[in-house]
């Protein structure tokens, strides 16, 4: 908290610019009038202000606002934006997705933090429903809200969604849900060459058929064990002992430490002896 | 910071039920969606059931006629009815929030023969 002290001559900010990043803590308290900053917050970006700096425009802007800023001064927020607890944001009525898009872009690239998560309800709230540019926009920004989404809303996402999935942001998708995501994907990687397109498609494969894993396994991808066991037991069964050797390579070694669970457990026990024993592991069907 | 807490487990007989809760601090559940799992000791996770931010279902296999999923906004909780539970349903249930790495410590739910 910093002491209410007078502004020292000459001192009174006229607007917010560079000068300001010489002035101590006191002196911004003292010195910068909060309506003028809440005109002017569009140029507090601009300007490399210190942390503790920031805390005092912040304090301002509360002591101006004490009931929740004004959409007009929450749009310019920028970086203050991350100086924001949820309990602040809860304070917020945002309705435009332009103060959405510009507040989710501070924050890009970072895990969804509790003031994300608290402003898109906020947003959600301000809306009363969340249409599918919001959609859109929250996928774009972070992908993994697509498992958030029910398999009848994911049908309306546009393949540039898709592009920007990590493989753990899928990790919470259901089966249902990547049954929906995974033709989007295999439609928006079909130009990559082969390599990079299991890297990309990888994530989604809990989706996929029995005939898209027998034309992978064709094209020595080396799938790892824990994406073997995201697949859809329905689209391994099919699967014959050669086509799984393909599709696993070096890494059907693994399939001893998995016979025990689904879905390895299953197919295990629709081979032939006979063919389980080509792989030298000791499956039991 | 955002917190997740299940609560309801316990030990239960063959047959009986058990309603998990999953209550939310740090962040509203209702833009989101919530699942459930549960992991036995020396298996993998296994997703059990999950409602969608608009309040849809879905169910694994073995969950779906015997297990409920449902949500309260107000109270940001989300439950797990549990029906007719089997030994083999016996392991740490947990919620999280989906499409984030927020998810709770889990509650122990063991069904005894």
């Known amino acids: 908290e910093v002491e209410k002290t007078a502004c020292p001559s000459g001192k009174k900010a006229r607007e917010i610019d560079e000068s300001l990043i010489f002035y101590k803590k006191w002196e911004l308290e003292a010195c910068v009038d909060a309506a003028l900053l809440a005109t002017q917050m569009d140029r507090v970006n601009a300007i490399p202000f210190t942390y503790e700096q920031l805390d005092v425009l912040k304090h301002k802007l509360d002591e101006l606002y004490p009931q929740g800023y004004p959409e007009s001064v929450i749009q310019h927020l920028g970086y203050l934006f991350l100086k924001m607890s949820p309990e602040d944001i809860r304070k917020w009525n945002v309705t435009s997705l332009e103060t959405l898009k510009a507040l989710l872009e501070v924050n890009k690239g970072h895990e969804m933090s509790p003031q994300v998560a608290t402003l898109i309800d906020r947003f959600v709230k301000g809306r009363g429903q969340l249409d599918k540019d919001t959609l859109d926009t929250l996928t774009a920004f972070y992908p993994g809200y697509l498992c958030s989404l029910s398999p009848e809303e994911l049908s309306s996402v546009p393949p540039s969604s898709i592009w920007a999935v990590r493989p753990q942001d899928l990790d919470t998708c259901d089966p249902r849900q990547l049954d929906v995501l995974y033709p989007k994907a295999r439609l928006a990687f079909q130009n990559m060459n082969g390599s990079e397109y299991f890297v990309k498609i990888q994530s989604f494969l809990g989706g996929a058929p029995t005939e898209d894993l027998k034309a992978l396994s064709q094209q020595n991808v080396s799938m790892d064990l824990a994406t073997f066991m995201k697949l859809r037991t329905d689209a391994v069964l099919p699967l014959t002992v050669a086509e799984v050797q393909k599709l696993l390579g070096p890494h059907v070694e693994g399939l001893k430490a998995e016979e025990r669970h689904r879905p390895v457990r299953d197919w295990i026990l629709r081979q032939r002896q006979d063919d389980l024993d080509t792989l030298g592991l000791g499956l039991q069907g | 910071d955002v917190q997740l807490q299940e609560s309801g487990g316990g030990l239960v007989q063959a047959g009986g039920s058990l309603r998990l809760s999953c209550v939310g601090a740090g962040v509203s559940f209702s833009p989101y969606g919530i699942g459930w799992w549960r992991q036995a000791q020396g298996n993998q996770r296994e997703w059990v059931a999950s409602?969608?931010?608009?309040?849809?279902?879905n169910y694994e296999d073995f969950a779906k006629d015997r297990f409920t999923i449902s949500r309260d906004n107000t109270k940001n909780t989300a439950y797990l009815q549990m029906n007719s539970l089997k030994p083999e349903d016996t392991a740490v249930y947990y919620c999280q929030i989906l499409g984030t790495s927020y998810r709770g410590q889990g509650t122990q739910v063991t069904v005894s023969s």
């Open positions: 409602i969608y931010r608009s309040g849809s279902t």
